[in-house]
Amino acid sequence: HTAAQDNCTCPTNKMTVCSPDGPGGRCQCRALGSGMAVDCSTLTSKCLLLKARMSAPKNARTLVRPSEHALVDNDGLYDPDCDPEGRFKARQCNQTSVCWCVNSVGVRRTDKGDLSLRCDELVRTHHILIDLRHRPTAGAFNHSDLDAELRRLFRERYRLHPKFVAAVHYEQPTIQIELRQNTSQKAAGDVDIGDAAYYFERDIKGESLFQGRGGLDLRVRGEPLQVERTLIYYLDEIPPKFSMKRLT
């Protein structure tokens, strides 16, 4: 893959090692941790990004939210197993042979078990709700301006087509961005909503994954939109399977 023309870097992923060893001396970039080649014209998969990030692992914790099937990933850092396409493998295990099943965004969707645990398929997260609270402003943002700006941001920065931004809700100071994407809806080259949400989450936290690009500067009609807190809810095509004990 070509990365940046002049200096061999990956614009969309700073957690890469790049060298001009591709065909014809082209710049080729590989993700840290996995060594997998990445396409620097688009987002790197969340699985490869988590793998690259993992030097000091934390325990993954996942909560079921009020919507009975919604999952929240409380910054669940772990060293994931990724398939050859960079997607999460359905079953993840840690060094102590504790295993669990994950969805397509890498969030645990079953109780933890041992090596005998079976995860038949990678269940797709088809609906992501990004819940933001912005800092106080002189007045409320205009809803349609906010909607347009967020759609533009997701297209230009994260390459997500606006068709996948199902809705933008706003009740000052809460903004909710709904991303929806069924497997069948994804056409060639379309970014995965899980990857877009992860990049956005890291941007909001001031931990941009982009190389050399400034941090996220969100403005609506020139007015800065500064986010105080973020919660991301994940809804899977098949509801998660947790024991009743965990739900009480």
């Epitope: 070509t2 023309q5 614009p11 014209s41 688009t42 759609r151 533009r152 297209r155 230009e156 390459r159 087509h161 606006p162 068709k163 069924n182 069948s184 809806q185 994804k186 056409a187 060639a188 080259g189 379309d190 970014v191």
Partner: antibody, heavy 119, light 108 residues
Framework: QVQLVQSGAEVKKPGASVKVSCKAS????????MHWVRQAPGQGLEWMGE????????SYAQKFKGRVTITRDTSTSTAYMELSSLRSEDTAVYYC????????????WGQGTLVTVSS | DIQMTQSPSSLSASVGDRVTITCRAS??????LNWYQQKPGKAPKLLIY???RLESGVPSRFSGSGSGTDFTLTISSLQPEDFATYFC??????????FGQGTKLEIK
């Protein structure tokens, strides 16, 4: 091999509608975006709209909104572009083109359909 | 909408010449710039996508460069079959996706 075959040339009167078809073969029709682009005689290329055949999502250039409708028939792997309220300045060659979701590059094009609007 | 401006609008060159066509976007489009070749009576043909990536089957004498707002298409050594009209197109932002007005490359 990938092919996009369009319907034949049309002559229409002002105020009428035209429906151009584009039959895809050689790839999975529902796995790619389909776009429509037109070119007036001796002029440049003008993007009109797009569709994802998998879910029938469409979006159109503001200039054509209300006049253009893009549809598809997945059973025959065919996309359609209908333009209504035709005027003389709609005389052009209309192309369908397969698109990539990230680059929005058009890697395969139909042969084009000349639509002439004349009274 | 993003405006794409090509220059020159036409140019004359000879077989073997090195030719450069430029395309300027009215705002930053990162690297989401594609180039097409069109011959009279034919549909456009994709040459280069994402600024510099050569489409499969396109000769290596074609190359692209640039970033942000300024882009170039270079033909290192013109061949007789290269005389055609060339269009740039941006795929960066929300629709509509816009094209340059075209550059006609003629035989000197």
């Amino acid at each position: 091999q990938v092919q996009l075959v369009q319907s034949g040339a049309e002559v229409k009167k002002p105020g009428a509608s035209v429906k151009v078809s584009c039959k895809a073969s050689g790839y999975t029709f529902t796995s790619y975006w389909m776009h429509w682009v037109r070119q007036a005689p001796g002029q440049g290329l003008e993007w009109m709209g797009e569709i994802t055949p998998s879910d029938n999502y469409t979006s159109y250039a503001q200039k054509f909104k209300g006049r253009v409708t893009i549809t598809r028939d997945t059973s025959t792997s065919t996309a359609y572009m209908e333009l209504s309220s035709l005027r003389s300045e709609d005389t052009a060659v209309y192309y369908c083109a397969r698109g990539h979701g990230n680059y929005v590059s058009f890697d395969y094009w139909g042969q084009g359909t000349l639509v002439t609007v004349s009274s | 909408d993003i405006q794409m401006t090509q220059s020159p609008s036409s140019l004359s060159a000879s077989v073997g010449d090195r030719v450069t066509i430029t395309c300027r976007a009215s705002q930053d489009i990162s690297n989401y710039l594609n180039w097409y070749q069109q011959k009279p009576g034919k549909a456009p043909k994709l040459l280069i996508y994402y600024t510099s990536r050569l489409e499969s089957g396109v000769p290596s004498r074609f190359s692209g460069s640039g970033s942000g707002t300024d882009f170039t298409l270079t033909i290192s050594s013109l061949q007789p079959e290269d005389f055609a009209t060339y269009f740039c197109q941006q795929g960066y932002t929300l629709p509509p996706y816009t094209f340059g007005q075209g550059t006609k490359l003629e035989i000197k």
